[in-house]
């Protein structure tokens, strides 16, 4: 004969556990139903009555099967440096991510708590490592034979143009100025191929490394705390 299916609430076998989407209620000492995502426990079970669930109110959610008496509050509205990539629904929290030109300096369980503006490399410095969603730009001084004349979070050091006759030598923050009408570019950053001994490495001044963070880099604090983790909600 097939085993009888137990309907909640029921007492588990000694040493046994409750089934998926059920929980053991310590007070009733019964296996009782959890509530589905988007709902919460309005009435806990007793020995003879199962859990009564109710929908989450506006701006609250539950993401997992649960028996929490109150839904979690959705996070506060995304701040001006963020974009809402997931709206607050009864089943999921709002997710805010950093807008272009910013990165997440302090992440939370989902989304970002604190965004910061990407560092801009000043003239004489180029991007060594580009910014990502969670890391800042890393700047480096332009090597001999390369330059950057912009304040940018994306521009790398570019090779100087190769002149037949140099009018003004290039440096870390300025390209070379040629007198001839047909300058050429070296093929690789830092590799300077000179057809004539007119323009040599000694003409490239090595800049003194200096702080490469552009002035005005700003941090924006979140409007409110992140919601607590949902308690006791695993399947």
């Amino acid at each position: 004969l097939p085993a009888q299916v137990a309907f909640t609430p029921y007492a588990p076998e000694p040493g046994g556990t409750c089934r998926l989407r059920e929980y053991y209620d310590q007070t009733a000492q019964m296996c009782c139903s959890k509530c589905p995502p988007g709902q919460h426990a309005k009435v806990f079970c007793t020995k003879t009555s199962d859990t009564v669930c109710d929908s989450c109110e506006d701006s609250t959610y539950t993401q997992l099967w649960n028996w929490v008496p109150e839904c979690l509050s959705c996070g506060s509205r995304c701040s001006s440096d963020q974009v809402e990539t997931q709206a607050c629904t009864r089943e999921q929290n709002r997710i805010c991510t950093c807008r272009p030109g910013w990165y997440c300096a302090l992440s939370k369980q989902e989304g970002c708590r604190l965004c910061a503006q990407l560092r801009k490399c000043r003239p004489g410095f180029g991007v060594a490592r580009p910014g990502t969603e969670t890391s800042d730009v890393v700047c480096k001084p332009c090597a001999p034979g390369t330059f950057s004349n912009t304040t940018s979070s994306t521009d790398i050091c570019r090779p100087h143009q190769i002149c037949h006759v140099v009018a003004i030598p290039g440096n870390a923050s300025m390209d070379a100025v040629c007198t001839s009408t047909s300058p050429t570019r070296s093929m690789a950053p830092g590799a300077v191929h000179l057809p004539q001994p007119v323009s040599t490495r000694s003409q490239h001044t090595q800049p003194t490394p200096a702080p490469s963070t552009a002035p005005g880099t700003s941090f924006l604090l979140p409007v409110g705390p992140s919601p607590p983790a949902e308690g006791s909600t695993g399947d």
Partner: antibody
Framework: QVTLKESGPGILQPSQTLSLTCSFS??????????VGWIRQPSGKGLEWLAH???????FYNPSLKSQLTISKDTSRNQVFLKLTSVVTADTATYYC???????????WGQGTTLTVSS | DVQMTQSPSSLSASLGGKVTITCKAS??????IAWYQHKPGKGPRLLIH???TLQPGIPSKFSGSGSGRDYSFSISNLEPEDIATYYC????????FGGGTKLEIT
């Protein structure tokens, strides 16, 4: 408006049985999630949960007093009753009834009734 | 049975000040803790349930926090009408009250 009111004998002799009544209004014990419980406070001491009963007649008792306690209800008359047998002087206390929510905390309380156990 | 250890048992504080009371459970109570204010001759008054949810009509000067076994309750901007005894109640596994904290204001 939710109100609860306790009534009892006031004075008992040791070994007698205490009978308490809680009369309430503003809610019904036929409503899912409703419960009524009893709590006591001996003079100068803290609160002690005794027992309670749910809308579906499920009952819970304090394990240390379970053999002496009986809780029951009359849904139509909005009343809950508690019996405590074989009282002793240590049962001298103020007895409160309180409403239980569906998520199990007491939200409304009566003002209490005082019991003195003395020979 | 779950035991609730409430401390301190009494405390004195100044008008306008802030006090914090703690309750420690003998086991994890899953945030199922409530806090009550009790004045002589009256029934206890529910202030907070589920660790930090303020009961409707209760001023925000009362607050609660905690998880697992450790919970706290605070009253800020103390006023004469806050003189009372305060109790925690765990309702995660049957029902147990803390021993109470008698608050005096100087």
């Amino acid at each position: 408006q939710v109100t609860l009111k306790e009534s009892g004998p006031g004075i008992l002799q040791p070994s007698q049985t205490l009978s308490l009544t809680c009369s309430f209004s503003g809610f019904s014990l036929s409503t899912s999630g409703m419960g009524v419980g009893w709590i006591r406070q001996p003079s100068g001491k803290g609160l002690e949960w005794l027992a309670h009963i749910w809308w579906d007649d499920d009952k819970f008792y304090n394990p240390s007093l379970k053999s002496q306690l009986t809780i029951s209800k009359d849904t139509s008359r909005n009343q809950v009753f508690l019996k405590l047998t074989s009282v002793v002087t240590a049962d001298t206390a103020t007895y409160y009834c309180a409403r239980l929510t569906g998520t199990r905390y007491f939200d409304y309380w009566g003002q209490g009734t005082t019991l003195t156990v003395s020979s | 049975d779950v035991q609730m250890t409430q401390s301190p048992s009494s405390l004195s504080a100044s008008l306008g000040g802030k006090v914090t009371i703690t309750c420690k459970a003998s086991q994890d109570i899953n945030k199922f803790i409530a806090w009550y204010q009790h004045k002589p001759g009256k029934g206890p008054r529910l202030l907070i349930h589920y660790t930090s949810t303020l009961q409707p009509g209760i001023p925000s000067k009362f607050s609660g926090s905690g998880s697992g076994r450790d919970y706290s309750f605070s009253i800020s901007n103390l006023e004469p009408e806050d003189i009372a005894t305060y109790y925690c109640l765990q309702y995660g596994n049957l029902w147990t009250f803390g021993g109470g904290t008698k608050l005096e204001i100087t």
